[in-house]
Amino acid sequence: SWMWNQFFLLEEYTGSDYQYVGKLHSDQDRGDGSLKYILSGDGAGDLFIINENTGDIQATKRLDREEKPVYILRAQAINRRTGRPVEPESEFIIKIHDINDNEPIFTKEVYTATVPEMSDVGTFVVQVTATDADDPTYGNSAKVVYSILQGQPYFSVESETGIIKTALLNMDRENREQYQVVIQAKDMGGQMGGLSGTTTVNITLTDVNDNPPRFPQSTYQFKTPESSPPGTPIGRIKASDADVGENAEIEYSITDGEGLDMFDVITDQETQEGIITVKKLLDFEKKKVYTLKVEASNPYVEPRFLYLGPFKDSATVRIVVEDVDEPPVFSKLAYILQIREDAQINTTIGSVTAQDPDAARNPVKYSVDRHTDMDRIFNIDSGNGSIFTSKLLDRETLLWHNITVIATEINNPKQSSRVPLYIKVLDVNDNAPEFAEFYETFVCEKAKADQLIQTLHAVDKDDPYSGHQFSFSLAPEAASGSNFTIQDNKDNTAGILTRKNGYNRHEMSTYLLPVVISDNDYPVQSSTGTVTVRVCACDHHGNMQSCHAEALIHPTGLSTGA
């Protein structure tokens, strides 16, 4: 049988002689040269040669493990005399053992990493990895150890994992943002003679909110005219924050001062400035100077840095209100006056007052805007603002008069103001009630006494406070011997009733009834209206069939019914 162990060969042998691999040997070999050893298979006769007498195998060339890690060869032992094999042809392996001829190579030539500033010592930053093409199963040729060549004392690297961590407390981005760390990977477990490779790690400290906003000055002063409408920007203030991005965002607010209700502050998101704006109308004559306490604060605060102090700052803002020549100001936004419709010309209705709000208190003159009183019904005393009538009024023509009064500074006619006057004309009982319509009705020849032939309604242009109360009666001249009677219903209506049984249209075809309508107001007003009653022939239902020669306009509901 064959006697051998597994063969090993060191790659990239640099000696001048052939490299000895091992010996093929059969237990049939007596050492007398009767056996011949033959080598075939991978690289036989080329890479590997055999001494056919001794079975010694040598490598003729410099081998590289990475070309082929294993060579499989075949061995034969033949009896020289008979030419027959004394052993079965067998295969054996020559394993190429790796030498440390490959340095570790990092997966990246340059790594980029970030870590938050002020991180605790030992915070993970990034992991670097180096690979070694040598055989990891043999020796330490591929065992890589990491170390830091540049970047201490700020960072450290775990020797086995390549994990880079922070090594210094309170690294402040505002102090230094960029670090260049050089990491070495060395094989042979980092021992002497190991091969090494390096990589650069560019580490950037990212911002955290560890700085509060700060006003560059403690006091700001701005001026604004008293005429500035709400929303007008007065001035800008800016606090600075050493942080960046979201951590440098600032919110401004007014926390104190007499101007708390009069002014606002809004944050300009683009410039991070606080814009002071007018909130309410200002009045130089009331208050000339305001002071505000404005606060700048970070909206996003990291609780772990609160020990550094409050993340806000405040400044005093002094606002000087500048005087503006203002037009006169009326004592009211609008005036409502009343006057009876029977008022005589030159009757005073009321008065308006306007004052110059400026310190100068310029005198004022009053006038009526004639575009609002084209008929010149009213006038005003230019000195004292008294309003009086210049024409007679009629409530029934116009109930409300809406006019505009102008107040003008005498010394500066450009400064003027206007105010609306609403003048209500009060009712006086100056109209008599009258029929609501023209009444023309009929009565059947065979009508019975006390039969209702018409209901009367009245209207009155006046508008008494307690409502209309009309009374109806026959005119005195027709009251005696009338063929009809008036029944006052006490509800502002009256009925015409027949006073006898039967009428003869041939005797009397038409009756004219004078009716007096009176109101119940002071002074009492009354009028007389005439109702025309025609005598007609009717059917047994009471429906009109024919009247006297004149045609009768027959309004709805004139049928006498039962």
Partner: antibody, heavy 120, light 107 residues
Amino acid sequence: QVQLLESGGGLVQPGGSLRLSCAASGFTFSSYAMHWVRQAPGKGLEWVSFISSLGSYTYYADSVKGRFTISRDNSKNTLYLQMNSLRAEDTAVYYCARETAGYGYAFDPWGQGTLVTVSS
Amino acid sequence: DIELTQPPSVSVSPGQTASITCSGDNIRKYVVHWYQQKPGQAPVLVIYRDNNRPSGIPERFSGSNSGNTATLTISGTQAEDEADYYCQSWDSFLAVVFGGGTKLTVL
């Protein structure tokens, strides 16, 4: 001329078995190490297994280890691949290839391939 | 263990030079072989031991290997060169590793 011819492919259910053959001609079969390589539909080449010239040494890809067995019969100039416990992911064209020392232990030539489909 | 990475596709105009790369950590220390595979056919060895051409392979095929990249170059590319190309090397012990393959399109 040097030729390799695979056979034995076909449709088989998951969990089933199949035996592939590769008949060699035109060279001294017993002097060469042989390999099986497969190619799933539309995918790249994947090495499967190796056998030395006399069959003393075999080696397998992790994906088939314990399920496939490579063998050879030098007297019949034939290479075999016994495939057991087949899975859907074993569906591929299977090629046999000769390892040629003269070409730096590259694969030359290759057989035309045989298709194995594992499906229920 | 070495891992070989190839671009999925490369395009070239006829007559131009096509370069197909195969990258792996320290690949220069490994011998690389290249195979051509046309649709429906078995692979064919076109370059062995980094830069050697088997008999019958046109001279326009050449190879190189340095650093972390091995390259197959086809100069004066012809329409018939349109195929999939694979790089291959020996891995640990007796295992073999292939690249993912590159589809060469001749426009």
